[in-house]
């Protein structure tokens, strides 16, 4: 058993049918010695008396808020949560496996640049009685500071019969140098509590691997005289690291017809302009990627050909 | 990216071209190592990230762009020098700061070259003959060193009398390639910045 926060304790259980469970001793936080009784949650049934209460925790019915009283007055509370270990592996009931970029990906994180700021998000089908708390650091043995905000509900989607809820959190490395070569990964730890179930999820990454630039901005077309060709120009996104000559991007320019089946013409360039043939009813899209370290491409910025 | 790519201007200073070749070569070599050594811990998540140049060179700090000198987090630890202008030493006069940056890059390349050559000698003794270093990568390191045009003492190739542990050697190869790829990215960024200065 360990303390998650003041008066909240996590009991780790080897989870299988008929498991013996864990013996837990609760102590009433009071100078009083006699006349103390114990109850669980809203029930008035007295579970025991005395300054300590010994319980065998096996199932969720044994978890909850234990309260010690004296003469009708509440003395202290202890909330017991359960953390299930199923055949040597901690349970992952609360969050959905996003399966991207690989199986067992519960937390996904992205950064728009090398400033040390990143966003992580996760999915669940649970709508109520759910709390998250997020901690992060650079490295784990001698951790350096990363500050995370509160996790917030960022999107709701309907997936088949189920509603899916997306939560996200923003974190910032306390002292980040955009040009630094990372040798220790960022560690992100999310504590999730649903009713009386506790779970924790972790992700470990280098900022360089989670970079996804914003789409190029100010995408414009300039028709070339007496030609079906147009000059496409764009700019680096505002959120990208500076100077741009050091943090350079490469770009992919795509001409896409109205029909998804039509052949796409693609050109790759390091410049912020390109000359392409603009077909009728087509659209021109541009996306960006770090020129030197191939992490994710940005989303597309698009303009119609007409 | 096996699709049309707009080619750089021919007037571009020589080191940029060499540094781009270097990054391409080390990335290809790393990819090959990860595929060939699929039963070894060779992914970024599995290896220890070691930097053989740590405490010997200070490329990141010495080559820091002027714009980042205001960022205190970039100025921690060592004495730092900043790039102001310039290009490859052979092509025009270079400031003192600039020389520090480029000589630091040169020292990095020299250190990695020695490590890779020593490692290749061990890998050639492996009866499995599973993986060897790409000669193209070694050649590209050499070309960039020549373009940087520094004269420094030659570091003797390390020779080892004991029987090599091929498993450990292959894991060390993965560690070296990951670290060298990260350094090659920094070198490319620096050269791109210098080219624009």
């Amino acid at each position: 058993i360990w303390e998650l926060k003041k008066d909240v304790y996590v009991v780790e259980l080897d989870w299988y049918p008929d498991a013996p469970g864990e013996m837990v001793v609760l102590t009433c936080d009071t100078p009083e010695e006699d006349g103390i009784t114990w109850t669980l949650d809203q029930s008035s049934e007295v579970l025991g008396s005395g300054k300590t209460l010994t319980i065998q925790v096996k199932e969720f019915g044994d978890a909850g808020q234990y309260t010690c009283h004296k003469g009708g007055e509440v003395l202290s509370h202890s909330l017991l949560l359960l953390h299930k270990k199923e055949d040597g592996i901690w349970s992952t009931d609360i969050l959905k496996d996003q399966k991207e970029p690989k199986n067992k990906t519960f937390l996904r994180c992205e950064a728009k640049n090398y400033s040390g700021r990143f966003t992580c998000w996760w999915l669940t089908t649970i709508s109520t009685d759910l709390t998250f708390s997020v901690k992060s650091s650079r490295g784990s043995s001698d951790p350096q500071g990363v500050t995370c905000g509160a996790a917030t509900l960022s999107a709701e989607r309907v997936r088949g019969d189920n509603k899916e809820y997306e939560y996200s959190v923003e974190c910032q490395e306390d002292s980040a140098c955009p040009a630094a070569e990372e040798s220790l990964p960022i560690e992100v730890m999310v504590d999730a509590v649903h009713k009386l179930k506790y779970e924790n999820y972790t992700s470990s990454f280098f900022i360089r691997d989670i970079i996804k630039p914003d789409p190029p901005k100010n995408l414009q077309l300039k028709p070339l005289k007496n030609s079906r060709q147009v000059e496409v120009s764009w700019e680096y996104p505002d959120t990208w690291s500076t100077p741009h000559s050091y943090f350079s991007l490469t770009f992919c320019v795509q001409v896409q017809g109205k029909s998804k089946r039509e052949k796409k013409d693609r050109v790759f360039t390091d410049k912020t302009s390109a000359t392409v043939i603009c077909r009728k009813n087509a659209s021109i899209s541009v996306r960006a990627q770090d020129r030197y370290y191939s992490s994710s491409w940005s989303e597309w910025a698009s303009v119609p050909c007409s | 990216r096996n699709l049309p790519v707009a080619t750089p201007d021919p007037g571009m200073f020589p080191c940029l071209h060499h540094s781009q070749n270097l990054l391409r070569a080390v990335s290809n070599m790393l990819q090959k190592a990860r595929q060939t050594l699929e039963f070894y811990p060779c992914t970024s998540e599995e290896i220890d990230h070691e930097d053989i140049t740590k405490d010997k060179t200070s490329t990141v700090e010495a080559c820091l762009p002027l714009e980042l000198t205001k960022n205190e987090s970039c100025l921690n630890s060592r004495e730092t020098s900043f790039i102001t202008n310039g290009s490859c030493l052979a092509s025009r006069k270079t400031s003192f700061m600039m020389a520090l940056c480029l000589s630091s890059i040169y020292e990095d390349l020299k250190m990695y070259q020695v490590e890779f050559k020593t490692m290749n000698a061990k890998l050639l003794m492996d009866p499995k003959r599973q993986i060897f270093l790409d000669q193209n990568m070694l050649a590209v390191i050499d070309e960039l060193m020549q373009a940087l045009n520094f004269n420094s003492e030659t570091v003797p190739q390390k020779s080892s009398l004991e029987e090599p542990d091929f498993y450990k050697t292959k894991i060390k190869l993965c560690i070296l390639l990951h670290a060298f790829r990260i350094r090659a990215v920094t070198i490319d960024r620096v050269m791109s910045y210098l080219n624009a200065s």
Epitope: Y16, P17, E86, G88, D93 | -
Partner: antibody, heavy 115, light 112 residues
Framework: QVQLVQSGGGVVQPGRSLRLSCAAS????????MHWVRQAPGKGLEWVAF????????YYADSVKGRFTISRDNSKNTLYLQMKSLRAEDTAVYYC????????WGQGTMVTVSS | SYVLTQPPSVSGTPGQRVTISCSGG????????VKWYQQLPGTAPKLLIY???QRPSGVPDRFSGSKSGTSASLAITGVQAEDEADYYC????????????FGTGTKVTVLG
């Protein structure tokens, strides 16, 4: 004590369907994940499918994906395996089993797919 | 499509020490725990070892499990006639958990 009693096995023609049941007692069935495992005559153990405690997630072996469906009725304390488009290679003893470091197995039920 | 490899058979005389190996990879035995089962003819498998080296109550102490790197092994110290059975190792794979990965199985024969 924990008990898993299986039923539903038998002889069936290729292409036909069969449903296996596994009735649980002696524990809170709705709290635990459950597996189906099979063993072809004279062969080793092969995992078939898994279902989470609340039925929210189901996982299948590639060899049965799209043909077999694992389900559970927590109000009846029963686990099911619906098998469709049966093939000769599905002939095996099928076992249900609890998920956990200590597990309990059903007695097994024989499924024979033969014309 | 077994990923965990066991020797098809091992044998020993009563009282001898018999070991069965189970070889896997980094994504299964290398990063997950291992179980061992005993299966007597015509019966369901019986758990012998869980968590690499833990014995459930009721399992004789002549059975012991161990794991090193990407391999695990089961040892029967002082093998007895009633130990003649099939033995299976079981683990998980990081990417496909909770799918069970079983070993190919080993037939233990007690001679004499």
């Amino acid at each position: 004590q924990v008990q898993l009693v299986q039923s539903g096995g038998g002889v069936v023609q290729p292409g036909r369907s069969l449903r296996l049941s596994c009735a649980a007692s002696g524990f809170t069935f709705s709290s635990y994940g459950m597996h189906w495992v099979r063993q072809a005559p004279g062969k080793g153990l092969e995992w078939v499918a898994f279902i989470r405690y609340d039925g929210s997630n189901k996982y299948y072996a590639d060899s049965v994906k799209g043909r077999f469906t694992i389900s559970r009725d927590n109000s009846k304390n029963t686990l099911y395996l619906q098998m469709k488009s049966l093939r000769a290679e599905d002939t095996a003893v099928y076992y249900c089993k609890t998920h956990g470091s200590h597990d309990n197995w059903g007695q097994g039920t024989m499924v024979t797919v033969s014309s | 499509s077994y990923v965990l490899t066991q020797p098809p058979s091992v044998s020993g005389t009563p009282g001898q020490r018999v070991t069965i190996s189970c070889s896997g990879g980094r994504s299964n035995i290398g990063s997950k725990t291992v179980k061992w089962y005993q299966q007597l003819p015509g019966t369901a498998p019986k758990l012998l070892i869980y968590g690499n080296d833990q014995r459930p109550s009721g399992v004789p102490d002549r059975f012991s499990g161990s794991k090193s790197g990407t391999s695990a092994s089961l040892a029967i110290t002082g093998v007895q006639a009633e130990d003649e059975a099939d033995y299976y190792c079981q683990s998980y794979d990081r990417g496909t958990h909770p799918a069970l990965l079983f070993g190919t199985g080993t037939k233990v024969t007690v001679l004499g």
